[in-house]
């Protein structure tokens, strides 16, 4: 399937609009600090070049790889050294090292200003004045803040973004129409970014085998009627798509994702009965719909797993002949029978099974040795079940905000060295598991909760990797992808931590807090809570609760005062003194 000109091939496959959008995303994900106008200029230059190659594939430089073409273009940026420092050294390298170098410099937490949403009328005017620039700006702003965002999915978000403005800017009440849609896109976008970040971490830190195992388990749950060979083919194709996107090969990724959607829809009879509606949609919606499709019904009368994987005398023979294929079959068979298990639990079971076979197939009596392997699964299944039950009870008792606070305290005591903004962000997201998953019936709780927690803990891992401060975090993040959550759950209070010096400035608040949204106010309070625990790690729940009660009362009182600033100054001093006394600081 070799083409004389790769750039011409992708331009023709994707069309000009998608080509330009994907190149913009790719450039913004690599050079996250560059101004919008600079990126647009680079994209236009690449697009003009691609058109010359479409006209004549033999034209000069048209035979170069996309990495070479894109890398050369990025390296023309004049301010590379002053803006990006050592990333400029990448330009001295040859492909493929140069692209690897750019990938290594992607920043999960770039120092960029928070996106402030302008007034609705201002946005609608900008949209009408120049729709194309407005939508490009959206792609650019999201891509540079989320350097691993799944590019073809970002095109889908941009399409919805455009539809929202097209509809709402003509509405009688523009704000009532638009703002909920933008909120939904923002929340879904953050979730989508985090899910993709885990896929990329899985591929980059744990390798293709780890990602394929994840994909076998998930697709087997989703498509339990599909044959193992069919699932294997989908896994291979899906792995290629995500490897490309995580590697910055966005044109190939989008093209291959479209091919995969086409294949799935052409073969839906042998894949799943739930795909019909998805397959009637246009490309971007179709791919999104397939990725989110509900699990198909399990085939009736599936035989017991024990027959093939425990009772059979050929277990070791089958395992030895093709280890990964046999383990893949085990995972497929287990997963299609257990939509009620999280993917990470299924992978733990498969790992336990693999370890048992490795040990037992070398033993004198293999069958006797592995006969009880399924008994080893029981505690592995019960651990997440019990944890989810306890935490859902706590969530139902406390509500989301106070549940987040309980997790903030719990995680700050486990890993107090982690930065306060990271602890707040991660704990807030961990706390969202309650409203997201506890409403589900038992059969859907574990896959919802534990797989979501894997995504959130990966956020902690990637943020911590940028500036490592805790050996415990590094250990939990790097030892085993599927055991990250149990590893963090098992951490107790860090007894080696030396409490932070008390700094009254940390607990000094001003009248500007009164104009913040409820969410931003919560974040302020939760930031203070983390700092309190860092000062006094041995503080009891009751002590912390009292201080948090006071903080809420303090903000409420001073925000209602005539002279807010004086109230914050005077009452703040008293609050700090009382809190210090209560906590024995």
């Amino acid at each position: 399937d070799a083409h004389k000109s790769e750039v011409a091939h992708r331009f023709k496959d994707l069309g000009e609009e998608n080509f330009k959008a994907l190149v913009l995303i790719a450039f913004a994900q690599y050079l996250q600090q560059c101004p919008f106008e600079d990126h647009v200029k680079l994209v236009n230059e690449v697009t003009e070049f691609a058109k010359t190659c479409v006209a004549d594939e033999s034209a000069e430089n048209c035979d170069k790889s996309l990495h070479t073409l894109f890398g050369d273009k990025l390296c023309t940026v004049a301010t590379l050294r002053e803006t990006y420092g050592e990333m400029a050294d990448c330009c001295a390298k040859q492909e493929p090292e140069r692209n690897e170098c750019f990938l290594q410099h992607k920043d999960d937490n770039p120092n960029l200003p928070r996106l402030v949403r302008p007034e609705v009328d201002v946005m609608c005017t900008a949209f009408h004045d120049n729709e194309e620039t407005f939508l490009k700006k959206y792609l650019y702003e999201i891509a540079r803040r989320h350097p691993y965002f799944y590019a073809p999915e970002l095109l889908f978000f941009a399409k919805r973004y455009k539809a929202a403005f097209t509809e709402c800017c003509q509405a009688a009440d523009k704000a009532a129409c638009l703002l909920p849609k933008l909120d939904e896109l923002r929340d879904e976008g953050k979730a989508s970014s985090a899910k993709q970040r885990l896929k990329c971490a899985s591929l980059q830190k744990f390798g293709e085998r780890a990602f394929k195992a994840w994909a076998v388990a998930r697709l087997s749950q989703r498509f339990p009627k599909a044959e193992f060979a069919e699932v294997s083919k989908l896994v291979t194709d899906l792995t290629k798509v995500h490897t490309e996107c995580c590697h910055g090969d966005l044109l190939e990724c989008a093209d291959d994702r479209a091919d995969l959607a086409k294949y799935i829809c052409e073969n839906q009879d042998s894949i799943s009965s739930k795909l019909k509606e998805c397959c009637e949609k246009p490309l971007l919606e179709k791919s999104h719909c397939i990725a989110e499709v509900e699990n198909d019904e399990m085939p009736a009368d599936l035989p017991s797993l024990a027959a093939d994987f425990v009772e059979s005398k050929d277990v070791c023979k089958n395992y030895a002949e093709a280890k990964d294929v046999f383990l893949g079959m085990f995972l497929y068979e287990y997963a299609r029978r257990h939509p009620d298990y999280s993917v990470v639990l299924l992978l733990r079971l498969a790992k336990t099974y693999e370890t048992t076979l490795e040990k037992c197939c070398a033993a004198a009596d293999p069958h006797e040795c592995y006969a009880k392997v399924f008994d080893e699964f029981k505690p592995l299944v019960e651990e997440p079940q019990n944890l989810i039950k306890q935490n859902c009870e706590l969530f139902e008792q406390l509500g989301e905000y106070k549940f987040q606070n309980a997790l903030l305290v719990r995680y700050t005591k486990k890993v107090p060295q982690v930065s306060t903004p990271t602890l707040v962000e991660v704990s807030r997201n961990l706390g969202k598991v309650g409203s997201k998953c506890c409403k589900h019936p038992e059969a859907k709780r574990m896959p919802c909760a534990e797989d979501y927690l894997s995504v959130v803990l990966n956020q902690l891992c990637v943020l911590h990797e940028k500036t490592p401060v805790s050996d415990r975090v590094t250990k939990c993040c790097t030892e085993s992808l599927v055991n990250r959550r149990p590893c963090f759950s098992a951490l107790e209070v860090d007894e080696t931590y030396v409490p932070k010096e008390f700094n009254a400035e940390t607990f000094t608040f001003h009248a500007d807090i009164c104009t913040l949204s409820e969410k931003e106010r919560q974040i302020k309070k939760q930031t203070a809570l983390v700092e309190l625990v860092k000062h006094k790690p041995k503080a009891t729940k009751e002590q912390l609760k009292a201080v948090m009660d006071d903080f809420a009362a303090f903000v409420e009182k001073c925000c209602k005062a005539d002279d807010k600033e004086t109230c914050f100054a005077e009452e703040g001093k008293k609050l700090v003194a009382a809190s210090q006394a209560a906590l024995g600081l």
Epitope: K545, A546, V547, D549, D550, A552, A553, F554, E556, K557, E571, K574, L575, A577, A578, S579, A581, A582
Partner: nanobody, 123 residues
């Protein structure tokens, strides 16, 4: 002018019960944390129980399980139900109001105090 008036004290036998009341006036009662304190002869004033403006309750170890603090925002009153009383509970019981739970717990610059009511537990 803010006033806190305690009532309900008296003489009671060990093992008995009493219910103290504290009626507040001149302040936005529902916005304040309210607390009960006691002072035995020759001893320092100590905190017994606190209820926050959001109805969260806090007790000292000696009060836990025996005493219950509650509030009625409509009546601007805070209560202390004392059961299983012991001779060592003998003291003058004071009611106080402050914006902050921790100020009450640690007796830090407390805004408003009542005059107190005597509780005597005989053996």
């Amino acid at each position: 002018e803010v006033q806190l008036v305690e009532s309900g004290g008296g003489l009671v036998q060990a093992g008995g019960s009493l219910r103290l009341s504290c009626a507040a006036s001149g302040l936005s009662f529902s916005r304040y944390a309210m607390g009960w304190f006691r002072q035995a002869p020759g001893k320092q004033r100590e905190y017994v129980a606190v209820i926050s403006s959001s109805d969260t309750t806090y007790y000292t170890n000696s009060a836990k399980g025996r005493f219950t603090i509650s509030r009625d925002n409509a009546e601007n009153t805070v209560y202390l139900q004392m059961n299983s009383l012991k001779p060592e509970d003998t003291a003058v019981y004071f009611c106080a109001a402050d914006s902050f739970v921790t100020a009450l717990q640690t007796l830090t610059q407390i805004n408003y105090w009542g005059q107190g009511t005597q509780v005597t537990v005989s053996s």
